[in-house]
């Protein structure tokens, strides 16, 4: 029991979660492609979720998608429309801590 407690303590001591760069606001044109980048690092590797206007982002085949990257996560929106305007937020967690960043797409 003592040794397992020590291992657990070491894991907790080494865990971290950092927002490496705040998300930028993005201005683009109708029909273009926008990319929003969530730049976070952590241990354990963080889980990242995307929100638009405080609601989970709805992925759309061939138009709106997000995926993990070496720096965190990237949200890509193709064929932009005015209706895509809004607040985009990424929320990252490593199970212990939570960090988030918000950008506005105009």
């Amino acid at each position: 029991p003592t040794s397992s407690w020590n291992i657990s303590s070491e894991l907790n001591k080494d865990s971290y979660l950092t927002l490496d760069e705040p998300m930028n606001n993005i201005t683009t044109s109708l029909g273009q492609t926008a990319e929003l980048h969530c730049k976070v690092s952590g241990n354990p590797p963080p889980t990242i979720r995307w929100f638009k206007n405080d609601a989970p982002v709805v992925q759309e085949p061939r138009r709106l998608s997000f995926r993990s990257t070496i720096y965190g996560s990237r949200l890509r929106i193709r064929n932009l429309d005015t209706t895509d305007t809004g607040y985009f937020q990424c929320v990252a967690t490593n199970g212990k801590e939570v960090v988030s960043s918000t950008g506005v797409l105009f």
Epitope: N53, D54, A55, V58, D84, Y87
Partner: antibody, heavy 119, light 107 residues
Amino acid sequence: EVQLVESGGGLVQPGGSLRLSCAASGFTFGSYFIHWVRQAPGKGLEWVAAIFPAGGYTYYADSVKGRFTISADTSKNTAYLQMNSLRAEDTAVYYCARYGSMGGAFDYWGQGTLVTVSS
Amino acid sequence: DIQMTQSPSSLSASVGDRVTITCRASQSVSSAVAWYQQKPGKAPKLLIYSASSLYSGVPSRFSGSRSGTDFTLTISSLQPEDFATYYCQQYYWFPGTFGQGTKVEIK
């Protein structure tokens, strides 16, 4: 305390102009979308226009595009709706409203100002 | 354009009744739906946001729920001050779309 106060409504003839004001206080004005929403007598709510004051980004409903202009003065914490070529169907109570900090719906509304377009 | 189809357009109920109003979105709006209450001559007031979150200061008899693209506002026990018109709104797709409204009248 967050407050939005509209003014500038009144009676105007068809083809005339009017400028509405929305004075904001109690929050960082430039960092929120400010919208104008109208309600014709006995009818539902209709979105009219929006602006993000910090960048001057503007958006319009098709029904008012080319006739109405939304603007904002961040030094005065005030949004404006310039209404030209007014029509009878523009008769309504006009509300300004704030989108929440994460875009979470219209969390604050003004009291409204009545615009009547009639000869 | 995204449509929010609200029903019923009006209903009659008594104090103490449980009242349910529904809105159906024409496409996915995630959980970005709000409900507002409006009384004659007054501005709308936010009741529910994010489909089911109760806005600050709103009585707990009001609740919201979501099932796919169907959204429901429930008043568990209607009070005299609840007689008003209620609107749903999606705000996932800018600039948002309102339902047609539901007038709750005294039976």
